[in-house]
């Protein structure tokens, strides 16, 4: 193999910090999996840098990542999903830094979607429902969800509820009357697969009813 950088380039490169992090998404596009890596230092000069993964692949020994702006990614069916892969930052044939990673331990689920809140007048509660693409997946099916909600005026005062289903009931008496609330949800692998929180779903906004003066209950 060939393709070495100039010596000066390598000497400069060795002064930099090439720490990176990666996450995998399984069956993210039909049966295709993806692997995304990025440098932790956003100021790294990535001009001649490439990422390569070797080992725990089905059809080839190594694969090169594709570069899009400052992220590097692979989308393929060819991850074995058993054992560790070696992911390296390379200049030509020289490896600047490498990590041995089991792709099943860096899974980032897709964000939940279709979040909605319905008020049930008779029950005096709010039913929160959302959807996740993972219900249809072969691999990462079991997730823990984190539902976070806040009164719109309380910028950093989020209340979090963890659940394994896609339905949650919020009691009316636990919420402020006549208030606007924001709610959102994210997911993390919860069985066999390990990894990171998904992105948050788009927020949903709902208003709680006013208190009915005669009964002390919300309208």
């Amino acid at each position: 193999e060939s393709g070495y950088a100039q010596n000066g380039d390598l000497e400069d490169a060795e002064l930099d910090d090439y720490s990176f992090s990666c996450y995998s998404q399984l069956e993210v596009n039909g049966s295709q999996h993806s692997l995304t890596c990025a440098f932790e230092d956003p100021d790294v000069n990535t001009t001649n840098l490439e990422f390569e993964i070797c080992g725990a692949l089905v059809e080839v020994k190594c694969l090169n990542f594709r570069k899009l702006q400052e992220i590097y990614f692979i989308e393929t069916k060819k991850f074995l999903l058993i054992g560790k892969s070696n992911i390296c930052v390379k200049v030509g044939e020289k490896s600047l830094t490498c990590k041995k990673i089991d792709l099943t331990t860096i899974v980032k689920p897709e964000a939940p979607f279709d979040l909605s809140v319905i008020y049930r007048e008779g029950a005096n509660d709010f039913v929160v429902t959302f959807n996740t693409s993972h219900l249809q997946k072969k691999y990462v099916k079991v997730l823990m969800h984190d539902v976070a909600y806040r009164q719109e005026k309380d910028e950093n005062k989020w209340t979090h509820v963890n659940l394994s289903s896609t339905k949650l009931t919020l009691l009316q008496r636990k919420l402020q009357p006549a208030a606007m609330y924001e709610i959102k949800v994210r997911s993390i692998p919860d069985h066999y697969f390990k990894g990171f929180w998904s992105e948050w779903s788009p927020s949903y906004y709902f208003r709680t009813p006013e208190i009915n003066n005669s009964s002390g209950e919300m309208d």
């Epitope: 193999e1 060939s2 393709g3 001649n48 490439e50 089905v58 059809e59 080839v60 020994k61 190594c62 694969l63 090169n64 990542f65 594709r66 570069k67 692979i74 393929t76 060819k78 390379k90 030509g92 044939e93």
Partner: antibody, heavy 122, light 107 residues
Framework: QVQLVESGGGLVKPGGSLRLSCAVS????????MAWIRQAPGKGLEWVST????????YYPDSVKGRFTISRDNAKNSLYLQMNSLRAEDTAVYYC???????????????WGQGTLVTVSS | EIVMTQSPATLSVSPGERATLSCRTS??????LAWYQQKPGQAPRLLIY???SLHIGIPARFSGSGSGTEFTLTISSLQSEDFAVYYC?????????FGGGTKVEIK
């Protein structure tokens, strides 16, 4: 449609140099690894070189390493093979080939040029 | 370096018969194997990749099997246009390598 057209072949003396070109059309060259593969008269296929989609990595067998250099100019939709210190055993039809899969490096080839003949003889 | 061995070197078959071509590798290449057909004066044509996936436009009478180090290309019922040279190629690792070829000729 996808087309690969090689040029630059010819008769050269042992020790001489030649530069092959491959003009591509019908696809985005920068998305693909590209390769040169050769076939000596009456013989089988022999892989000569591969270049990654970015052009940052190149690969050669021992038989040509240090003598041949693969390069690409995505803006000109062209792939090149610079051949130095040519030997009689380099005589072959040289094919430019594109892998079926874009990116990453799955090197099986679904598009081939028609080939250009390189003859090394005194 | 992975060494590719194809057998037989020549296979004599009558039209309509089944042809079985073999390809062995010196190391485990999982399913990183392709098959090509080449006719005189033409460039090779991809038939099979991933050891058993039929390339688009290739007739279903062609099939590939095997994994690890032993692979087979089968032509279920030879047509006149199938008489050609067939090559296997490993793309599991560099250096990429082709087998020596099997010539399928009319019996």
């Amino acid at each position: 449609q996808v087309q690969l057209v090689e040029s630059g072949g010819g008769l050269v003396k042992p020790g001489g140099s030649l530069r092959l070109s491959c003009a591509v059309s019908g696809f985005t060259l920068s998305d693909y690894y590209m390769a040169w593969i050769r076939q000596a008269p009456g013989k089988g296929l022999e892989w000569v070189s591969t270049i990654s989609a970015s052009g940052l990595r190149t690969y050669y067998p021992d038989s040509v390493k240090g003598r041949f250099t693969i390069s690409r100019d995505n803006a000109k939709n062209s792939l090149y093979l610079q051949m130095n210190s040519l030997r009689a055993e380099d005589t072959a039809v040289y094919y430019c080939a594109r892998p079926m899969s874009a990116h990453y490096g799955f090197n099986y080839f679904d598009y081939w040029g028609q080939g250009t003949l390189v003859t090394v003889s005194s | 370096e992975i060494v590719m061995t194809q057998s037989p070197a020549t296979l004599s078959v009558s039209p309509g018969e089944r042809a079985t071509l073999s390809c062995r590798t010196s190391e485990d290449i999982y399913n990183g194997l392709a098959w090509y057909q080449q006719k005189p004066g033409q460039a090779p044509r991809l038939l099979i990749y991933s050891a058993n996936s039929l390339h688009i436009g290739i007739p279903a009478r062609f099939s590939g099997s095997g994994s690890g180090t032993e692979f087979t290309l089968t032509i279920s019922s030879l047509q006149s246009e199938d008489f050609a040279v067939y090559y296997c190629q490993q793309y599991y690792d560099y250096p990429l390598a082709f087998g020596g070829g099997t010539k399928v000729e009319i019996k």
